[in-house]
Amino acid sequence: SIPWNLERIIPAWHQTEEDRSPDGSSQVEVYLLDTSIQGAHREIEGRVTITDFNSVPEEDGTRFHRQASKCDSHGTHLAGVVSGRDAGVAKGTSLHSLRVLNCQGKGTVSGTLIGLEFIRKSQLIQPSGPLVVLLPLAGGYSRILNAACRHLARTGVVLVAAAGNFRDDACLYSPASAPEVITVGATNAQDQPVTLGTLGTNFGRCVDLFAPGKDIIGASSDCSTCFMSQSGTSQAAAHVAGIVARMLSREPTLTLAELRQRLIHFSTKDVINMAWFPEDQQVLTPNLVATLPPSTHETGGQLLCRTVWSAHSGPTRTATATARCAPEEELLSCSSFSRSGRRRGDWIEAIGGQQVCKALNAFGGEGVYAVARCCLVPRANCSIHNTPAARAGLETHVHCHQKDHVLTGCSFHWEVEDLSVRRQPALRSRRQPGQCVGHQAASVYASCCHAPGLECKIKEHGISGPSEQVTVACEAGWTLTGCNVLPGASLTLGAYSVDNLCVARVHDTARADRTSGEATVAAAICCRSRPSAKASWVQ
Amino acid sequence: QDEDGDYEELMLALPSQEDGLADEAAHVATATFRRCSKEAWRLPGTYIVVLMEETQRLQIEQTAHRLQTRAARRGYVIKVLHIFYDLFPGFLVKMSSDLLGLALKLPHVEYIEEDSFVFAQ
């Protein structure tokens, strides 16, 4: 009779581990920026510090009647979901509440900023163990709120935010759109996106993953032993904050990048029905439902990667899109995708000391996305080798010429606007292992990395018949680092990685034009990290 | 989100109102004004003035004070509600929107954002 949400996110092997030490206090501290809370509730009593922080706007309406239990409702429920004795995710975690939302659940960007600054000051005055900040709120896109989250994240604080309940692109809201926060969408007991009246969970590239957020049983501020069910992306974010608290409790030195990568890697994949999301958002939205990951001791030195999509470039002729990895991550490959297929490719360049993934729109194109593959590669030394476009009819070869460097990704960028005169570039895995090969008018970029025990190989899969997409997956134990589409149809939409699957997309009209001998090939670069081994290229 | 999404950014390079302050007249506004794309969520009259990242503590206070002084010269009373030191350099101010052009021309100002609502989710 365990509540469905806890069953979903905490695998069976963790349940017993938790039952053995229900009150095992950890040094992790969760800061909740929300409404006031009822600290005397039995779920959270003794675990919650209600700070004196209060920065809220006046309630609307002259006839508004402040009722304590209603004022405390949202925050109390979330505090219970994070650290409640009986229905909480991280039962032993201490929580600090800051009031930034009024009795109607409204706050301001400025009040939230002052709250975040309060946490930073507390951190400076009295440094403690790991800090998790839960932001179960959303407003319109705010550059300063996102910047404040970035600054706080760079001090080692882990921020978890609600994606928003507007059935809209999460990138249009803050703090959901801040790359440095872990942004959480909401799913129900059937692992489907949560509908809330006419609206529902937000979606899109700014969402990192989903978590239970429908009919969640938690502390009710109505009475000290009351429970109620609430729904929303706040509840989903609270689950992830609880998971993060538990991860940090076990391993306090985990960084934001490691936490995010592990949350993504160990989440439940492909259970969400993507048809609920708008068609143009389906490819950008992660099909991931959070679960509590095992500790790093149990899983060894796995190579962890995630896919980061850029914002849409827009349709102008020279429009570019840029995708960035987090500071700790290595950009192992860069690809591009355009719904019209009119794109001039992708490349990696250094901006302000950081490698970024860029994609360029083509004349008549509706715009492109840059797709970065961002990985955690301990002690990595990565570099980009590029060769300008060759003369007509010649191939361009780029390989990793430094000793012990392996190819982790290829990018291709065409100088010519006319898509009909060029052939797609290729990866050659047989005759020339570990090379990126470009054709007519293509500049070729090879991403080369050296790291202890890093080994990589190319895996290809081609389809000759009509097909909208071609996929190739890396086998168990290997991680997808690069994904490209190889010659076939004259027009491909591009390629991108979905978890460990490389997806090459083909234009509908191209399928009709194509002769059966002209296969479209998805080419994946699969790598693994074996700390005891030398870096190598696997034939 | 690298690009500013559904977001209003206005360049307010308003003509300088001469008030005998040479440095003000000389300083052309390169800072931008931003506000929430959803009109109902805006809080006009309250603004977050964000200064360049390297701005020192004393300069933050000086910039806020300078804005108050110049506003007063024009017959406006402004209220500095909060000064941000620890996460980013800046200050929160309650003032008339008439003063935005003036504020954008202050030294060290990177951008000004109109305050807006956030909501429990």
């Epitope: 109505d222 009351c226 069910s229 | -």
Partner: antibody, heavy 126, light 106 residues
Framework: QLQLQESGPGLVKPSETLSLTCTVS??????????WGWIRQPPGKGLEWIGS???????YYNPSLKSRVTISVDTSKNQFSLKLSSVTAADTAVYYC??????????????????WGQGTLVTVSS | EIVLTQSPATLSLSPGERATLSCRAS??????LAWYQQKPGQAPRLLIY???NRATGIPARFSGSGSGTDFTLTISSLEPEDFAVYYC????????FGGGTKVEIK
């Protein structure tokens, strides 16, 4: 049908620790649907809640008694226990154990004390 | 803590009569109030929960009403087995009990 039975010494000396056990039969103490509580009633007086425990071991106590109370659970024996330290004559009472719906599983029934054990009188005297 | 005051302390009535017992809270307990019946030498028994809901097996002659700070337990027609002590209890803020009302035979 669920039954609760209190057991323990009927006489405790002042300043010592009072120890009682409640044995649950006809149902499992390891249900996430219930808390298990202790309530006392001094002779001729009203009822006072002492504290409650969940199967996982999480507890919550009456603030006025918190410093002296420890409640523990033994799921293997289907029992939960009360320890009250530094007792005085004012702790003389009939001690009851009772089940309380946790609220975590709303369908489990009303969030009140029901059923109760028949109670055991503990006298504090030298 | 929330203090519950019961009145009257003693109610002397005859079988068949209507009994009205009052419980007043020092602050609002919403509808988080229950009534228990205790007979000599027995444990209390839950009669009414959440102010007005009858517990399983409780006869229809018992009813509860009220919310906020003022609550009433009504026994429409007293039966011989109803003569006992009645306690109210709140769970708005932890658990506290009233001092009890004794319903005795007149």
């Amino acid at each position: 049908q669920l039954q609760l039975q209190e057991s323990g010494p009927g006489l405790v000396k002042p300043s010592e620790t009072l120890s009682l056990t409640c044995t649950v039969s006809g149902g499992s103490i390891s249900s996430s649907s219930y808390y298990w509580g202790w309530i006392r009633q001094p002779p001729g007086k009203g009822l006072e809640w002492i504290g409650s425990i969940y199967y996982s071991g999480s507890t919550y106590y009456n603030p006025s008694l918190k410093s002296r109370v420890t409640i523990s659970v033994d799921t293997s024996k289907n029992q939960f226990s009360l320890k009250l330290s530094s007792v005085t004559a004012a702790d003389t009472a009939v001690y009851y154990c009772a089940r309380e719906n946790s609220g975590v599983v709303p369908a489990a029934g009303p969030n009140w004390f029901d059923p109760w054990g028949q109670g055991t009188l503990v006298t504090v005297s030298s | 803590e929330i203090v519950l005051t019961q009145s009257p302390a003693t109610l002397s009535l005859s079988p068949g009569e209507r009994a009205t017992l009052s419980c007043r809270a020092s602050q609002s307990v919403s509808s988080y109030l229950a009534w228990y019946q205790q007979k000599p030498g027995q444990a209390p028994r839950l009669l009414i929960y959440d102010a007005s809901n009858r517990a399983t097996g409780i006869p229809a002659r018992f009813s509860g009403s009220g919310s906020g700070t003022d609550f009433t337990l009504t026994i429409s027609s007293l039966e011989p087995e109803d003569f006992a002590v009645y306690y109210c209890q709140q769970r708005r803020n932890w658990f506290t009990f009233g001092g009890g009302t004794k319903v005795e035979i007149k």
